[in-house]
Interface confidence: medium
């Protein structure tokens, strides 16, 4: 896995795909649908939770026309994820074993429709826009989980959540080294997919403890980190620009070399 | 919770046939797909085959089992099946049943319920 050095660990290829618009549908172009599973196990919130887990992580719960508009794009998940409208929903783009789930063998989003509040599930978000900039943070011992917090913190930052990173990959971040996010998870992004980092389409890659894509990284297991400066903020010094963004939209990476 | 109880197993020569039952009780859960999965002396727990429990529910197999196992199910008796044709020695293993909420990979750590188990026996 990118990044991780001898540590065993599990990545997902996570298909993320941009969304453009929809007709009617209240969002901007470029905007991204992305599942979400913010703790260890898999199937865990119920619908108020789900809200809420898009919201900490700087997105909204995905509309069942965001998710069709995604699937039509290409995206495909194996994993059923609450929507707007209080549906279960997910994904299949080419029906297939091992996902156990789809009645018949054509492609389409899924759904079980209206579940009760209280059945727990994943969560499909949506984030459009990114009020600021990713930057990726480095040193040479690399940071436990709390050394990342705090590090962000020092260079007048946050350690950058889940739906900001995926804004700023959808905006053209490109790093094959999995970093600390603020919900403990490890993901890198991906814009052009090569052998070494993780699959062959592009997306945000997320480092799983086990082989069925659950469990968080150890925290105090040293990685890079993800750290997200809001607009208003002024940079530090001792941070270098790490190459010239290939985002048209001028998401900054910034290295910091600074031990 | 979802109670599974397995049976049907026992001994039979090679390229002979058993039919394994697992009966599901507890609530009715319409979002539960249905498998069995095996697991031979000194091995780890593998993926046999796997029913949706929908109307005209999808199946799934793996590739060891694939023209020779047969996974159906009985809605109105909440009751999985495994006819299981052609065996051989290698099929030798504790047979589980599982259940588990959909969509769900193959991995046995998704299924969230287990059965005890019965054991089948390959061997002339």
């Known amino acids: 896995t990118p990044g991780l050095g001898p540590a065993t660990a599990f990545t997902s290829e996570d298909l993320v795909v941009q969304v453009t618009a929809v007709p009617g549908q209240p969002h901007l172009p470029g905007g991204v649908v992305f599942h979400y599973r913010p703790g260890p196990t898999r199937y865990s919130l119920t619908f108020e939770e789900a809200q809420q887990a898009c919201l900490r992580t700087g997105a909204v719960i995905a509309s069942p026309e965001q998710l069709q508009a995604a699937y039509e794009a290409g995206y495909e998940q194996c994993d059923a994820g609450w929507l707007r409208d209080q549906t279960v929903r997910y994904p299949i783009v080419s029906p297939r074993t091992p996902c156990v789930g789809d009645k018949d063998s054509s492609p389409g989003v899924r759904t079980y429709g209206v579940r009760p509040s209280t059945e727990t599930y994943d969560v499909y978000c949506f984030v459009d826009r990114l009020e600021g900039e990713v930057f990726f943070a480095t040193r040479l011992e690399q940071f436990t989980f709390q050394e990342a917090l705090e590090f962000c913190e020092s260079h007048n930052a946050t350690l950058a959540t889940t739906g900001q990173l995926y804004a700023a990959w959808s905006r053209g971040l490109d790093k094959c080294y999995a970093g600390w996010l603020a919900d403990g998870s490890l993901r890198y992004p991906i814009v052009t997919p090569r052998p070494a980092c993780g699959g062959d389409k592009p997306g945000v890659r997320t480092v799983y403890l086990y082989p069925n894509q659950t469990g968080l990284p150890d925290p105090l297991s040293r990685h890079h980190a993800f750290c997200f400066r809001g607009i208003s903020a002024v940079p530090s010094p001792g941070e270098e620009e790490g190459g010239t963004p290939t985002s048209p939209s001028g998401v900054e990476e910034w290295i910091v070399t600074q031990v | 919770d979802v109670q599974l109880v397995e049976s049907g197993g026992g001994l039979v020569q090679p390229g002979g046939s058993l039919r394994l039952s697992c009966a599901a009780s507890?609530?009715?859960?319409?979002?539960?797909?249905m498998g069995w999965f095996r697991q031979a002396p000194g091995k780890e727990r593998e993926f046999v085959a796997a029913i949706t429990w929908s109307s005209g529910g999808r199946t799934y197999y793996a590739d060891s089992v694939k023209g020779r196992f047969t996974i159906s199910r009985d809605n109105s008796k909440n009751t999985v099946y495994l006819q299981m044709n052609s065996l051989r020695p290698e099929d030798t293993a504790v047979y589980y049943c599982?259940?588990?909420?959909?969509?769900?990979?193959?991995?046995?750590?998704?299924?969230?319920?287990w059965g005890q188990g019965t054991l089948v026996t390959v061997s002339s």
């Open positions: 507890g609530p009715t859960f319409s979002r539960y797909a």
């Open positions: 599982a259940a588990a909420r959909i969509p769900v990979r193959t991995y046995t750590s998704e299924w969230n319920y």
